[in-house]
Interface confidence: low
């Protein structure tokens, strides 16, 4: 991709639009992206559901995931599906269900810390949610070899969660929200999208 491609682009994956654009009615936690989004209204609605048809992925694979935890996963899904500002981190995926993925997106350290704090008392059975599930029933279930334990057991640090969970889609940044040098999962869209500034910063030296 050339530099202009990096600044405002949707990756080639399962549900993404081909080009970013306004989506005035994006649902709930995805609404910050409504001015310019890679997700459709339908996708934004679907990813808020407990048992979404988008990926047939069950957050509650080890019993109840607390809503405080789940809202971070919803926000993660909104960023993944809706953000047009992740161009510098798009890589070839080589998977049947998507041609591209994100790798090492520099997530603001507070976003990762808060995600980990909110989820530490919920339960899971795996360190990498991209692979190793039992899909025989059509939804993800824990394999027999993977016992349900607290998030804190499988993810002892914030970085182990944010970086390990989706096979290094994120890298925890040393920068803070508002620095212009890390990607924010959470932001107040009335102040604009802070990730637009971030992607310009990274694209400038990725293409120089």
């Amino acid at each position: 991709r050339d530099r202009t491609d990096l600044l405002n682009v949707c990756m080639d994956a399962k549900h993404h639009k081909t080009k970013p654009g306004p989506e005035d009615k994006l649902h709930d936690q995805c609404s910050p992206w409504k001015r310019n989004a890679c997700c459709s209204v339908n996708t934004s609605q679907e990813l808020h559901k407990d048992n979404s048809r988008l990926y047939n992925f069950n957050w509650d694979h080890c019993g109840e995931m607390t809503p405080a935890c789940k809202r971070h996963f919803i926000q993660d899904a909104c960023l993944y599906e809706c953000s047009p500002n992740l161009g510098p981190w798009i890589q070839q995926a080589g998977q049947s269900w998507r041609k591209e993925r994100f790798l090492d997106v520099p997530l603001c350290k507070e976003d990762c810390q808060e995600w980990w704090e909110a989820c530490r008392t919920s339960f899971t059975c795996k360190r990498d949610w991209h692979k190793g599930w039992d899909w025989t029933s059509g939804i993800n279930k824990c394999p027999d070899t993977a016992p349900c334990r607290t998030f804190q057991y499988y993810f002892p640090t914030p970085a182990s969660l944010c970086e390990g969970l989706w096979s290094h889609s994120y890298k925890v940044s040393n920068y803070s929200r508002g620095s212009g040098q890390c990607i924010q999962m959470w932001f107040d869209s009335t102040q604009g999208n802070p990730n637009e500034e971030v992607v310009k910063f990274y694209a400038s030296f990725m293409t120089s």
Epitope: D50, N51, N58, T66, P67, A68, K70, A118, S122, I139
Partner: antibody, heavy 115, light 106 residues
Framework: QIQLVQSGPELKKPGETVKISCKAS????????MNWVKQAPGKGLKWMGW????????TYTDDFKGRFAFSLETSASTAYLQINNLKNEDMATYFC????????WGQGTSVTVSS | QIVLTQSPAIMSASPGEKVTMTCSAS?????MHWYQQKSGTSPKRWIY???KLASGVPARFSGSGSGTSYSLTISSMEAEDAATYYC?????????FGSGTKLEIK
């Protein structure tokens, strides 16, 4: 519009069984789990647990393990709470509430236990 | 489990008066939610994620707080606000409710 409609009041004797229904409408039933909440007369709200309407898997809090059972009739968009071997302390109003945000509640079902 | 303590248990306010009730958590929670319940009816979601008003809730209501200390405020009491208000957390399993604050109109 979204509605949760519960079955009517029940009068039972100690040792009997009661089964309360909660019929959902206005949304896709299997997209949201269902909570059950107990309110004893003049008391506060107590979460009993929930059922995953997609997988059918129930989760019970410690106080409601054993005699209590959550179940589903997915084709009818209905969740059930069954209480076996009723005791006096089970006398309460039971509410179903849509999972997570508890944004929609049933009107409640009063269960009276009297010999 | 996290214990939520509401105070006061019962309070009364005159029309137009400012009302504040509190909810204290035994451990830090990420968000607090509030439900309104009137006698003989089911609870209604009133305030969620600490400060967001549920659909149809009048703007005179507000919620605030963090950590272990949260509050619900009514800027100007009206007769229809008389009810019992429950705080609730679901930052940690199991979700728990406070014992309620009964608000009466003078």
């Amino acid at each position: 519009q979204i509605q949760l409609v519960q079955s009517g009041p029940e009068l039972k004797k100690p040792g009997e069984t009661v089964k309360i229904s909660c019929k959902a409408s206005g949304y896709t039933f299997t997209n949201y789990g269902m909570n059950w909440v107990k309110q004893a007369p003049g008391k506060g709200l107590k979460w009993m647990g929930w059922i995953n309407t997609y997988t059918g898997e129930p989760t019970y809090t410690d106080d409601f393990k054993g005699r209590f059972a959550f179940s589903l009739e997915t084709s009818a968009s209905t969740a059930y709470l069954q209480i076996n071997n009723l005791k006096n302390e089970d006398m309460a109003t039971y509410f179903c509430a849509r999972k997570g945000a508890m944004d929609y509640w049933g009107q409640g079902t009063s269960v009276t236990v009297s010999s | 489990q996290i214990v939520l303590t509401q105070s006061p248990a019962i309070m009364s306010a005159s029309p137009g008066e400012k009302v504040t009730m509190t909810c204290s958590a035994s451990s830090s929670v990420s968000y607090m939610h509030w439900y309104q319940q009137k006698s003989g009816t089911s609870p209604k979601r009133w305030i969620y994620d600490t400060s967001k008003l549920a659909s149809g809730v009048p703007a005179r209501f507000s919620g605030s707080g963090s950590g272990t200390s949260y509050s619900l405020t009514i800027s100007s009491m009206e007769a229809e606000d008389a009810a019992t208000y429950y705080c609730q957390q679901w930052s940690s399993n199991p979700p728990t409710f406070g014992s309620g604050t009964k608000l009466e109109i003078k």
